[in-house]
């Protein structure tokens, strides 16, 4: 549109172009016009460019006029926004840039008989480009002087010197673009093409085998796979092979056959020859064992003195035969070595779709919820499990149940109620629907029915299992009793479930471990190893560290057994007079090599890392965001390129910051709408959208911009006794105990007398990470052997 604005008028004498006065006669004395002033208004005519302006002819580009806007002299420069002095001429053609403009000032006669009279006329031919800027023009000749300004502006979405270039931003199927100041389409991130409706696929997406409909996508053609559609799909069933083109199966080394499933090196892959037998490959999936003396069978598995190696498992008894041995299995077991549990689930005795679980010498039916009994033959009373949440009663039906709901509830379990949340909660609280009511879940620091006042976070007794609640600003902390941990003292881990102890050993649950109390004949962490008690042959004391026993396992017919007084970390050295000393392994010290030297003494772990002492070594448990042997390296949280849509990533400690571009928002510049999504704040933090940023309100025990850094307050002061190391675990802590101590805070002395280290009815005396044997009459030595 073409716009013209009258700025000022100077008609000092109030005269017309023809020399007459606007209103009335002249004063005979000074010849000035008397009575009233001119009633000035303006007419405008816009037409094609004329080098010699002609007053007549049509106003081909448009014409218009103002109402009466003043008298003889006026100035409208200050009165912006007053449309009375503006003429707007819209045009529906391409603006030609050059034009001729006729502007006339007229006096309104205010009556129907007398015609209006012209005061002054101006003409101007020129060239003007569309712009928001005004161009000022002046008429300085004749009886009146006036000033006006003009401009040409394009309609919305039209650009260029002719206002004929159309560009309307869009983000839909037909295009995804904005418009620059010249009306050129600028594609949104992820789109390309003249209309910005072709998606840019994932970087690296194979142009040959992949394509996409949405930015960052990569959809594979038939026969191709992988993140970038650059990996061929091998022939179905191809086992040890690869492909260069789809549906091939090119075998790896030592494999053959159409599906590369024939092992050409059976010996190397399976090592089938036992008891020192030598293996030779004889063909695909074929081999031959040559056995050492005393062994035979295809895998050298048959020993001449078969029962010596205790081949019968699961308490089976062994009988030597001409072919080797024979096992007589205990109930529930079968097979040549009693290692196969008899399948008591064949046939399946479980009714109504129950799942049969095979046990040793028996079975157990895992019944569907509606059935019970040994074989799921009884209709379960579902009402016993109290499935009806908000009901008057529960009625048991065959293979089902019926809940008679209380008013306001519905659903099979009467657990669906009517939503009463209608925006009553204040201070950004969220609303939880109740039965015929609601409850406001308040943000930190607020309480009351509508979250209108502050809260004592301990009022709801959140700490479980006798935990003591400590109220703090905007949060609470639970001080847990021994045996419990977690932010609400809710964790009590039972490491004995399922029971890891074998051979009938009893399991004892500890804070972060378990302990198996082995029967006489077994030892090891899980009581899985058979003990050699020297029960069958007499022993001879050689010195204070060694006994000898008759044995046909050695050429000399004697086997020497060393004392275990120095424990697993030292060797016994015999001294004169029946005494001994312990030669300790690296990393151990003390009379019985029972003390682990503290390798953490030099504080090697940096950046808040926690040092855990090992054997002649240490390990650093790094604070969140650090890595390396000494926690010296800040983990690059930008390595996975988390910032989308052209956002720039800046690495922080255990966090990153995305500097978003082009109106993208959120932690990873992933959203056009909101700064928040479910992944913005970690560890249960609540996200608040603050317009051009987000803010995380962290639960107790966490801090940092995204609740990503654990506060180490749970380890201050150190709760771990007897030199235990405290490791921060969110709002809680874990103690790594020194040897000889156990329990959640390392307060219990480990029972070093378990399992029975003293032989021949010796009595064990337990110390701090050591023990002493008091021997029965007739026996001596550190372990009464």
């Amino acid at each position: 549109q073409f716009e013209l604005e009258i700025l000022s008028m100077q008609n000092v004498n109030g005269e017309l172009q023809n020399g007459n006065c606007c209103g009335g006669a002249r004063n005979p004395g000074d010849r000035k016009c008397t009575r009233d002033e001119c009633d000035t208004y303006f007419k405008v005519c816009l037409k094609e460019y004329q080098s010699r302006v002609t007053a007549g002819g049509p106003c081909s580009f448009g014409s218009g006029s103002t109402p009466v806007i003043g008298g003889n002299t006026f100035n409208l420069k200050a009165s912006r926004g007053n449309d009375r002095n503006r003429i707007v001429l819209p045009f529906s053609f391409a603006w030609p840039r050059s034009y001729t403009l006729l502007v006339e000032a007229w006096d309104s006669s205010n009556d129907t008989v007398q015609p209006d009279s012209i005061i002054e006329k101006a003409s101007h031919s020129g060239m003007i480009n569309p712009s928001r800027q005004w161009q000022t023009l002046k008429q300085n000749t004749g009886v009146a002087h006036f000033e006006y300004q003009i401009r040409v502006t394009c309609d919305d979405y039209y650009y260029g010197f002719g206002c004929n270039k159309f560009c309307r931003p869009r983000d839909d199927f037909f295009g995804h673009y904005a418009c620059d100041q010249n009306g050129n389409k600028t594609c949104m991130e992820g789109w390309m093409g003249p209309e910005c409706n072709r998606a840019i696929c994932r970087q690296g997406c194979s142009p040959k085998h992949g394509s996409c409909k949405l930015p960052g996508d990569c959809r594979c053609q038939y026969g191709w796979q992988g993140l970038y559609c650059d990996k061929c799909i091998p022939h179905p069933g191809c086992v040890h092979g690869i492909c260069n083109e789809p549906w091939q199966c090119l075998c790896e080394t030592n494999w053959g056959g159409q599906l590369c499933d024939k092992d050409l090196n059976y010996c190397g892959t399976h090592q089938p020859c036992l008891n020192g037998g030598t293996c030779s490959n004889t063909g695909p999936d074929k081999y031959q064992c040559s056995c050492p003396e005393g062994y035979s069978g295809p895998n050298c598995e048959i020993a001449e003195h078969a029962c010596l190696s205790d081949p019968c498992h699961n308490r089976g008894s062994c009988k030597e035969t001409s072919l080797g041995f024979e096992c007589e299995c205990s109930p529930g077991w079968t097979g040549p070595t009693c290692s196969t549990n008899i399948d008591d689930c064949s046939p399946n005795n479980c009714s109504h779709g129950g799942t049969c679980q095979d046990l040793v010498n028996g079975f157990k039916c895992v019944c569907p919820p509606q059935w019970t009994g040994k074989t799921c033959q009884l209709d379960a009373n579902e009402c016993e499990a109290k499935p009806c949440v908000n009901a008057k009663s529960c009625k048991n039906l065959i293979a089902s149940y019926y809940c008679d709901c209380l008013p306001g509830w519905m659903g099979q379990n009467c657990d669906i109620n009517i939503n009463d949340c209608l925006g009553q909660c204040q201070n950004d609280a969220s609303c939880r629907d109740l039965v015929n009511g609601y409850r406001c879940i308040c943000p930190p620091g607020y309480a009351g029915d509508h979250c209108e006042r502050d809260i004592d976070e301990c009022a709801s007794n959140p700490c479980l299992n006798g935990g003591h609640c400590q109220n703090e600003i905007n949060r609470f902390q639970c001080l847990c009793p021994t045996g419990f941990s977690g932010n609400l003292c809710q964790l009590d881990i039972d490491y004995c479930e399922p029971n890891p102890c074998q051979n009938g050993a009893q399991c004892y649950n500890r804070a972060s471990d378990y302990f198996c109390k082995c029967p006489e004949d077994y030892e090891g962490k899980n009581c899985s190893h058979l003990k050699d008690h020297c029960r069958t042959t007499p022993c001879e004391v050689i010195d204070s560290c060694t006994v000898a026993m008759a044995s046909n396992d050695t050429p000399e017919g004697v086997r020497y057994i060393s004392s275990n007084v120095c424990g697993p970390h030292g060797k016994c050295k015999s001294q004169s007079g029946g005494k001994f000393t312990c030669d300790c392994n690296k990393g151990f010290t003390g009379t019985y090599c029972h003390e682990n030297i503290n390798d953490c003494e030099s504080n090697p772990c940096r950046n808040g890392g926690t040092c855990i002492d090992g054997v002649n070594s240490y390990k650093c448990i790094c604070s969140d965001g650090w890595e390396g042997a000494y926690c010296e390296t800040n983990i690059n949280d930008c390595s996975q390129n988390p910032c989308h849509n052209g956002g720039t990533c800046r690495d922080l400690v255990n966090d990153f910051y995305c500097d978003c571009k082009n109106g993208w928002k959120g932690k990873t510049c992933h959203s056009r709408d909101s700064q928040c999504d479910e992944a913005t704040c970690n560890n249960g933090g609540t996200c608040y959208d603050e317009g051009d940023a987000f803010k995380c309100m962290c639960p107790g025990g966490w801090e940092g911009t995204t609740c990503n850094i654990a506060r180490n307050s749970s380890c201050l002061p150190n709760p771990c006794h007897n030199g235990g190391t405290c490791v921060v675990n969110g709002e809680s802590f874990t103690c790594v105990c020194k040897e000889g101590w156990e329990g959640p805070i390392c307060a219990q002395n480990t029972n070093d007398c378990s399992p029975h280290p003293c032989y021949n009815s010796g009595t064990c005396v337990d110390g701090d990470n050591w023990y002493r044997c008091e021997c029965a009459p007739g026996f001596a030595g550190p372990d009464c052997r």
Epitope: Y157, F166, D171, D172, F173, F174, P194, E195
Partner: antibody, heavy 119, light 106 residues
Framework: QVQLQESGPGLVKPSQTLSLTCTVS??????????WSWIRQHPGKGLEWIGY???????YYNPSLKSRVTISVDTSKNQFSLKLSSVTAADTAVYYC???????????WGQGTLVTVSS | EIVMTQSPATLSVSPGDRATLSCRAS??????LAWYQQKPGQAPRLLIY???TRATGIPARFSGSGSGTEFTLTISSLQSEDFAVYYC????????FGGGTKVEIK
């Protein structure tokens, strides 16, 4: 005022190819920002978009018809065309050509032509 | 494919009364939605685009609202020439139309 006019046979035999042409008057098919589309309406049913062509020749087809559809443009004649191969009775419909407007929406439509698939 | 569902299938209204037509998308289409009017034997006519912007020459009694998945076309005072079938159409993905709502005289 832009006007669109469909033309082509009203009867096609099963398994043959349906061919229609849309002639545009009152405006150039080469004007940027417009997508020239084909839409069909089965008797007494709703509308189904078939595909579009841009003056540059780039196309996009409804995925359910993609294997059978070809849309082409002849800017010198100010026309664009539809070919639908291997037709069955289920392709019997009124076929419209339409312009997707510079702002949004199908702002100009042809009057439609009924194509019957029958032997 | 984004599926568009219109309700009701038929709406009986007296001349001069208000008519409210609903359209639901199977996933968010933001504001990329258009409404069309079709009379028997005629091609559809564009009424609304961008969910709420009236097309050129469309009377002010037609108004559109909504964004995301729920949209409404309102005819404030039905005239005799407004009795027709109305279709909604999304264009966030390749264009799909609703099944239509027939507005008939009560």
């Amino acid at each position: 005022q832009v006007q669109l006019q469909e033309s082509g046979p009203g009867l096609v035999k099963p398994s043959q190819t349906l061919s229609l042409t849309c002639t545009v008057s009152g405006g150039s098919i080469s004007s940027g920002g417009y997508f020239w589309s084909w839409i069909r309406q089965h008797p007494g049913k709703g509308l189904e978009w078939i595909g579009y062509i841009y003056y540059s020749g780039s196309t996009y087809y409804n995925p359910s018809l993609k294997s059978r559809v070809t849309i082409s443009v002849d800017t010198s004649k100010n026309q664009f065309s539809l070919k639908l191969s291997s037709v069955t009775a289920a392709d019997t419909a009124v076929y419209y050509c339409a312009r997707w407007g510079a702002a949004a929406g199908f702002d100009y439509w042809g009057q439609g032509t009924l194509v019957t698939v029958s032997s | 494919e984004i599926v568009m569902t219109q309700s009701p299938a038929t709406l009986s209204v007296s001349p001069g009364d208000r008519a409210t037509l609903s359209c639901r998308a199977s996933q968010s289409v933001r504001s990329n939605l258009a409404w069309y009017q079709q009379k028997p034997g005629q091609a559809p006519r564009l009424l609304i685009y961008g969910a709420s912007t009236r097309a050129t020459g469309i009377p002010a009694r037609f108004s559109g609202s909504g964004s995301g998945t729920e949209f409404t076309l309102t005819i404030s005072s039905l005239q005799s020439e407004d009795f027709a079938v109305y279709y909604c159409q999304q264009y966030t993905d390749w264009p799909t139309f609703g099944g239509g709502t027939k507005v008939e005289i009560k």
